[in-house]
Interface confidence: medium
């Protein structure tokens, strides 16, 4: 039993860390295999993650871990029984992969404008709180090439669009993800979609 | 009993360049990583660059990095090492060594073969 | 990189000496250390692996300890074989590094 693709881990950097690797055959990752994990730090205790199958060779661990700070650094230990199979080590805050947002809401009663509202996915005393920026995919249902990005460069977790910018009568859904600049991170996976009708009162024209 | 025997080795001018092999039996060689170590005239041991089972390069000293790499067929049960821009400080005797896991290991390495000599002068 | 700091360079003891060599790592590497031994002409000979773990086949006189940052090979009861160069070298991460080497000596 051998690894064939190392390990590789990202963090959200509040309390997991996710690792995944491949093995050169078909393996049961939770009863042949063990990922230690270890804070190097004086005192710091060694954790047992049991990985999960993601595909016939694949695995993967979810890493729980105390409040991360941009210091910290993990040594891992993937074993197969008595067996050493690989070794490594993991700096959280430079593998950073933020949560994905959350409860995405879609407001159609503000006149003719649309508003998104979503939550940060970070409590208020986690450094990413404060500097994570946003993605907003918003796509029509019926016609593939009606499809747009909108980057929300500011803080707060909302973006207005007017209603007009979009096709009325028919349905839109809409997604958002984070990243955070100051960690170079990785984009969180994207929230799960919301549906809704856009209609809107179209201009009187004067001939 | 497990062998590793290097071969190679000679006499090269600097800025040339030099292949060294090192033949393994005795052991499933692709159930292990291997290594290059060096020891200079008279001087101490000093590991050149690793390689796991699958030929995925486990790095270099900085003193040959960019310049040597370390390469192995399992079919063949051979270990190598391709040495460019050879430079006088590379001389050195040359040892092929095994590991005792396939990527990392708790134990090392446990085997050295007998070394081939490389020697880089004008 | 992990640097290797070994001690003492050079050694002169006599049969029946117990010895000690030193090994220092500049940043932790739990247990991840080899012992080994040169004779003159020859390959380098495995004693200890994992610190503490004596190499089968390797007299009981010799032992190692330690764990982190430092580490120590010891001869309990120098024999005429044991007067050799030695070395550690630490796995934990790549590069690999050897300390500088202890030259041991009959006195």
């Known amino acids: 039993m051998k690894v064939l693709q190392e390990p590789t881990c990202v963090s959200d950097y509040m309390s997991i860390s996710t690792c995944e690797w491949k093995m050169n055959g078909p393996t049961n990752c939770s009863t042949e295999l063990r990922l230690l994990y270890q804070l190097v730090f004086l005192l710091s205790e060694a954790h047992t993650c049991i990985p999960e199958n993601n595909g016939g060779a694949g695995c993967v661990c979810h890493l729980l871990m105390d409040d991360v700070v941009s210091a910290d650094n993990y040594t891992l230990d993937l074993w197969a029984g008595q067996q050493l199979l690989w070794k490594g080590s993991f700096k959280p805050s430079e593998h950073v992969k933020p949560r994905a947002p959350g409860n995405l809401t879609v407001h159609t009663n503000v006149s003719d404008t649309l508003l998104l509202t979503w939550s940060n996915p970070y409590p208020p005393d986690n450094y990413l709180y404060n500097h994570l920026t946003y993605a907003v995919n918003i796509w029509s249902e019926n016609d593939p090439a009606d499809f747009r990005i909108y980057n929300v460069t500011y803080l707060e977790p909302s973006l207005r669009i007017a209603a007009s910018t979009l096709k009325s009568g028919i349905s839109y859904r809409a997604r958002v993800r984070a990243w955070a600049q100051c960690y170079n991170t990785t984009w969180s996976e994207w929230s799960p979609s919301t549906k809704w009708h856009n209609s809107y009162r179209e201009p009187f024209e004067q001939h | 009993e497990i062998q590793l025997v290097e071969s190679g080795g000679g006499l090269v001018q600097p800025g040339r360049s030099l292949r060294l092999s090192c033949a393994a039996s005795?052991?499933?060689?692709?159930?292990?990583?291997m290594h290059w170590v060096r020891q200079a005239p008279g001087k101490g041991l000093e590991w050149v660059s690793g390689?796991?089972?699958?030929?995925?390069?486990?790095g270099y000293a900085d003193s040959v990095k960019g310049r040597f790499t370390i390469s192995r067929d399992n079919a063949k049960n051979s270990l190598y090492l391709q040495m460019n821009s050879l430079r006088t400080e590379d001389t050195a005797l040359y040892y092929c060594v095994k590991d005792t896991g396939s990527w990392a290991s708790y134990y090392g390495m446990d085997v050295w073969g007998h070394g081939t000599t490389v020697t880089v002068s004008s | 990189d992990i640097q290797m700091t070994q001690s003492p360079s050079s050694l002169s003891a006599s049969i029946g000496d117990r010895v000690t060599i030193t090994c220092r790592a500049s940043?932790?590497?739990?247990?991840?250390l080899g012992w080994y031994q040169q004779k003159p002409g020859k390959a380098p000979k495995r004693l200890i692996y994992a610190a503490s773990s004596l190499q089968s086949g390797v007299p009981s006189r010799f032992s190692g300890s330690g764990s982190g940052t430092e580490f120590t090979l010891t001869i309990s009861s120098l024999q005429p074989e044991d007067f050799a160069t030695y070395y550690c070298?630490?796995?934990?991460?790549?590069?690999?590094?050897f300390g500088q080497g202890t030259k041991l000596e009959i006195k």
């Open positions: 940043q932790g590497i739990r247990n991840d």
């Open positions: 005795g052991f499933t060689f692709d159930d292990y990583a």
């Open positions: 390689i796991n089972w699958n030929n995925g390069s486990l």
């Open positions: 070298l630490q796995h934990n991460s790549y590069p690999y590094t």
